[in-house]
């Protein structure tokens, strides 16, 4: 598993460095998660040919994965800091059930999958401290999440491989869009 943010060799070598700002910590946390996703995708791609599937083919799925849209205020046009931050936090909370699903999907990268899940929880906490309007953030319903998890786990092997690939790719794209937007805040 990659070294958690704040524990890399550079930090050890420079103990008197300025402490990270809130934005730097968030940036580092997202990149740490992205690194974890890359490692998980390597195992997924080695195991199945999902990674060769076209994006169009993958889009034909019934997963309701969080996605950035123009209305969310995170893009160049119509950028809105508060709306965007709410979307990022809400999206991350919605991804949590999918990250839970990933926990039993990896053999050699079990720790890595756990690290991605735990790091995402930490990222959500960081971002909630940054948000002014916490009331606007909708938390997913636990009962709905539980039945979704059961449904995903009941799929056949091929669909489970497809689901794993889609979750990782979508989560990566969501995090990248989030990081770009957060850089402007």
């Amino acid at each position: 598993a990659p070294v958690p943010p704040g524990e890399d060799s550079k930090d050890v070598a420079a103990p008197h460095r300025q402490p990270l700002t809130s934005s730097e910590r968030i940036d580092k946390q997202i990149r740490y998660i992205l690194d974890g996703i890359s490692a998980l995708r390597k195992e997924t791609c080695n195991k199945s040919n999902m990674c060769e599937s076209s994006k169009e083919a993958l889009a034909e799925n019934n997963l309701n994965l969080p996605k950035m849209a123009e209305k969310d205020g995170c893009f160049q046009s119509g950028f809105n800091e508060e709306t965007c931050l709410v979307k990022i936090i809400t999206g991350l909370l919605e991804f949590e059930v999918y990250l839970e699903y990933l926990q039993n999907r990896f053999e050699s990268s079990e720790e890595q999958a756990r690290a991605v899940q735990m790091s995402t929880k930490v990222l959500i906490q960081f971002l909630q401290k940054k948000a002014k309007n916490l009331d606007a953030i909708t938390t997913p319903d636990p009962t709905t999440n539980a039945s979704l998890l059961t449904k995903l786990q009941a799929q056949n092997q091929w669909l489970q491989d497809m689901t794993t690939h889609l979750i990782l790719r979508s989560f990566k794209e969501f995090l990248q869009s989030s990081l770009r937007a957060l850089r402007q805040m």
Partner: antibody
Framework: EVQLQESGPGLVKPSQTLSLTCTVS??????????WSWIRQPPGKGLEWIGV???????YYSPSLKSRVSISWDTSKNQFSLKLSSVTPADTAVYYC??????????????WGQGTMVTVSS | QSALTQPPSVSGTPGQSVTISCAGA?????????VSWYQQLPGTAPKLMIY???TRASGIPDRFSGSKSGNTASLTISGLQAEDEADYYC??????????FGTGTKLTVL
Amino acid sequence: EVQLQESGPGLVKPSQTLSLTCTVSGGSITSRYYAWSWIRQPPGKGLEWIGVIDYDGDTYYSPSLKSRVSISWDTSKNQFSLKLSSVTPADTAVYYCARDPDVVTGFHYDYWGQGTMVTVSS
Amino acid sequence: QSALTQPPSVSGTPGQSVTISCAGANNDIGTYAYVSWYQQLPGTAPKLMIYKVTTRASGIPDRFSGSKSGNTASLTISGLQAEDEADYYCASYRNFNNAVFGTGTKLTVL
């Protein structure tokens, strides 16, 4: 020092598929956050972004070319490739490959190949 | 996918300052700090000059500077020299991992 070198046929017939390869030396194409783009320049005209393949092998294409373009890689050879189908004379251009050092928050190209001229003509 | 708009040509005499503008449509440039500038000499590949709006690439003299105001980015070259004569292109990130280039500007040193 990172170096990029384009290769492929200089002449392609209309309606055929244009295929180019970019060989990268001095660094791995799978290094984290790097991305590898194809950019073209018709004679006497400006630069046009075609598409990109990132450090995970994910691809993104220009909306205007999306239906005809495909970018892939061969990590064992440290190469990435461009395929453009159903070409017309309007696709005649110098084709460049280039590196983005940080696809997450970079969006700039610090290393370029020298470019290869492709003419579409029967 | 419409290109960013640049003036077709600008000119100046040695020692002067010139500014090349790069205007975005649909707020391409407005919010995000992902504008870069490239110099292209005849028959050669473009060369990175400025990235992230204001950061000079390695080895680029401080005569070259970048800025942004609203939906327009600018490249300023001060103390113009004969070897600065070239085509200049801006580029920007566009939503969904897309990039777009400017129309290009021919700089002539008189």
